[in-house]
């Protein structure tokens, strides 16, 4: 049985997938920051899990997924203070009791060293310094992705 | 409604201890940051300490580092403050007050719990 | 740190006196300023949060705004439970910092 958060997490992806595909992101739009191939959005207001996935999701964007360490620090050095905190893409799944994020897969272990309680309704936050278990009802900041679409040259078929 | 009470505070000698606790009631305790905020006699406010949710995160003044501890036992829905190696400039009133993360205000205070140190 | 500067320090006025304080800020704070209200032997009150949101339950006399480093708390019409001392706080970064405090007296 899925939590109302597993639910709306789903939920999201799947109309996510449903849309027509949209022209590839050459450029992050106006306030948007390009990490690498990606273009983050650090909220300035204050949700809870749930609600930053939703904003996300109109943004046409999702909640941060970090691939790996590496990702983790270089998106760190853009907090400017210890005492922010921001929710990523990661919520616990009551049903596979695994950390998972929202685009399905599971947290490899060696991924994030996470601070505090894997259990129904803990959902991931990132700092300056850590990554840390919150109850997903509580209402921080929130950072979203855009992935950049890397630019090819075009190959034309002979007319 | 919302409360938080504050107790533990008295009379200690520079140098001494003393813990204080904050019992909160009227909301989902291990859903807020929370943070202890103090005021001199007859002075202003001053940040002391701050917690996250879920305890995993602290923060401190500088005036503080070291000789204070913040936590928090959401099984009691209580935030402590321990404070040891007290100086004379630690007398205030301490509150307790919801809040925390940045950008937080402190929404809601107790009623605050007077330490005073002096030999 | 971040440094936060009220004036004046003490001010006197009269019931329905309209009464303005103001906070200044170190460097760019943002909209990120808190007014509090205290009196004397309580606890303090939030009354603006954000610079410029009335907090729930508080007189829609109080009004906040500014953004960057200068900020204003005005009451609009002053009542006789409004004396008291008033405070600004930033939440930008940490330490968290307060005003040194505004005393509204009986004129």
């Known amino acids: 049985q899925k939590s109302s958060i597993e639910k709306c997490s789903v939920d999201i992806q799947q109309s996510r997938n449903k849309t027509t595909e949209r022209p590839g992101l050459l450029n992050c739009p106006i306030y948007w920051q390009q990490l690498r191939e990606k273009c983050l959005l650090f909220s300035h207001t204050v949700n809870p899990w749930n609600n930053s996935l939703a904003d996300c999701s109109t943004k046409e964007s999702s909640l941060l997924l970090i691939r790996d360490k590496d990702e983790l620090i270089h998106t760190q050095n853009l907090i400017r203070d210890k005492a922010i905190l921001f929710w990523i893409g990661l919520n616990f799944s009551l049903s596979e009791k695994n950390w998972k994020w929202i685009n399905g897969s599971f947290l490899n272990s060696n991924d994030l060293e996470i601070r505090g309680d894997a259990k129904e309704n803990s959902c991931i936050s990132i700092s300056q310094t850590s990554v840390y278990s919150e109850y997903c009802s509580t209402e921080i900041r929130w950072i979203c992705q855009k992935e950049l679409t890397p630019v090819r040259n075009k190959v034309y078929p002979d007319s | 409604e919302v409360q938080l009470v504050e107790s533990g505070g008295g009379l200690v000698q520079p140098g001494g201890s003393l813990r204080l606790s904050c019992a909160a009631s009227?909301?989902?305790?291990?859903?807020?940051?929370m943070s202890w905020v103090r005021q001199a006699p007859g002075k202003g406010l001053e940040w002391v300490s701050a917690?996250?949710?879920?305890?995993?995160?602290?923060y401190y003044a500088d005036s503080v580092k070291g000789r204070f501890t913040i936590s928090r036992d959401s099984s009691k829905n209580t935030l402590y403050l321990q404070m040891n190696s007290l100086r004379a400039e630690d007398t205030a009133v301490y509150y307790c007050?919801?809040?925390?993360?940045?950008?937080?205000?402190?929404?809601?205070w107790g009623q605050g719990t007077l330490v005073t140190v002096s030999s | 740190d971040i440094q936060m500067t009220q004036s004046p320090s003490s001010l006197s006025a009269s019931v329905g006196d309209r009464v303005t304080i103001t906070c200044r800020a170190s460097?760019?704070?943002?909209?990120?300023l808190n007014w509090y209200q205290q009196k004397p032997g309580k606890a303090p009150k939030l009354l603006i949060y954000a610079a410029s949101s009335l907090q729930s339950g508080v007189p829609s006399r109080f009004s906040g705004s500014g953004s960057g480093t200068d900020f204003t708390l005005t009451i609009s019409s002053l009542q006789p439970e409004d004396f008291a001392t008033y405070y600004c706080q930033q939440t930008y970064s940490t330490p968290l910092t307060f005003g040194q405090g505004t005393k509204v007296e009986i004129k």
């Open positions: 007050a919801r809040g925390g993360y940045l950008p937080d205000a402190f929404d809601y």
């Open positions: 460097q760019s704070i943002s909209s990120y």
């Open positions: 917690i996250s949710g879920s305890g995993g995160s602290t």
């Open positions: 009227g909301f989902t305790f291990s859903s807020y940051a």
